[in-house]
Amino acid sequence: MGSAALEILGLVLCLVGWGGLILACGLPMWQVTAFLDHNIVTAQTTWKGLWMSCVVQSTGHMQCKVYDSVLALSTEVQAARALTVSAVLLAFVALFVTLAGAQCTTCVAPGPAKARVALTGGVLYLFCGLLALVPLCWFANIVVREFYDPSVPVSQKYELGAALYIGWAATALLMVGGCLLCCGAWVCTGRPDLSFPVKYSAPRRPTATGDYDKKNYV
């Protein structure tokens, strides 16, 4: 696959991953109460996210409440907010770096410098995926740990929400996309011999006797 194709595929994956990360960040479904038995009239599901919590009645009515005070939030929510938003912003920066280093743009003159810019964009996307992975896994660990913690009553037991799965898929796309961008850049910088695939060898010298080697003749 050509370096330009790798770049385009990598960039598309990163953009989809970035969108997924924004979605995961905003959704109030990082942790959800267990699936409900809809035979119970009073049944309700609680969703909790980084910015708000929602209560969904069995009737389908949903009521959401944005968290009032930042200081009242748990450490893990505050850290998850900071890291996820940082990852989203970093992906935004990585987009411009990648576009500047792309072969189809003229922001940077073609050559090793351009390829290095493209490589930087790929590395930034890789780092962005890792950065987003930290709060997702940390949060998931807390949810699972509390689910099995006997001190936590069943009313406070949550399960992994859709936002975490979307987030994990997004980080996978960002990291795969980042790898492809790095590969595309590496094809341009690290393998200069590929630019000149045809090799020419010097003509054979005559033998000591002045005659050409017999094997050259049929």
Partner: antibody, heavy 118, light 112 residues
């Protein structure tokens, strides 16, 4: 064999701080899943849950008494503690500590009678 | 907070009779994760500490006679003593072990 025993002042004056100790044996507050609860019962009345303290240090306190209650533990000496600040005659009751199995109270102490009176 | 309401407040029965007492919660105690109802019953004999009888609505604590039967679901629960014995003279309290703060019913006094 699990046993718990509460100890305290018996009688104290209004606005003072009530300090109770729960000494237990047969289990350790360092062991995974173990907790100690505090419950009180005014004479001839029902049971009121006050607080829980767990092996990992997490505590739960009845919101109606949140500003006045403190729970702590000393696992090395097999003890749990309850402090109630600014007591008044309404706090007169028998105070129990109980071993927790999740949110169940499966072993109870004999209780200590506390009277708040001037 | 979940409010627990017990009825009747007292009940007089003769030995050998069947007795039932009711406990209602202000919200469902059914946890959909395991389809279990988080309600317990305690017995407190005169001058003694409470003793856990039944948890998860119908599971008897070890050593509890099988004449004690718990039933119910959602918000309505019942404790039945199939054949009352003289030693069953006590106060009976229901408790939700579904959420904090843990709350008890006001109790049913069983008089023989």
């Amino acid at each position: 064999q699990v046993t718990l025993k509460e100890s305290g002042p018996g009688i104290l004056q209004p606005s003072h701080t009530l300090s109770l100790t729960c000494s237990f044996s047969g289990f350790s507050l360092n062991t995974y899943g173990v907790g100690v609860n505090w419950i009180r019962q005014p004479s001839g009345k029902g049971l009121e849950w006050l607080a829980s303290i767990w092996w990992h240090g997490k505590t739960y306190i009845n919101p109606s008494l949140k500003n006045r209650l403190t729970v702590s533990k000393d696992p090395s000496n097999n003890q749990a503690f309850l402090e109630v600040t600014n007591v008044d005659p309404a706090d007169t009751a028998t105070y129990y500590c109980a071993h927790a199995r999740a949110q169940l109270l499966d072993y109870w102490g004999q209780g200590v009678m506390v009277t708040v009176s001037s | 907070d979940i409010v627990m309401t017990q009825t009747p407040s007292s009940q007089a029965v003769s030995a050998g009779e069947k007795v039932t007492m009711s406990c209602k919660s202000s919200q469902s105690l059914l946890y959909s994760g395991d389809q279990k109802n988080y309600l317990a019953w305690y017995q407190q004999k005169p001058g003694q500490s409470p003793k856990l009888l039944i948890y998860l609505t119908s599971t008897r604590e070890s050593g509890v006679p099988d004449r004690f039967i718990g039933s119910g679901s959602g918000t309505d629960f019942t404790l039945t003593i199939s054949s009352v014995q003289a030693e069953d003279l006590a106060d009976y309290y229901c408790q939700q072990h579904y959420s904090y703060p843990l709350t008890f019913g006001s109790g049913t006094k069983l008089e023989i």
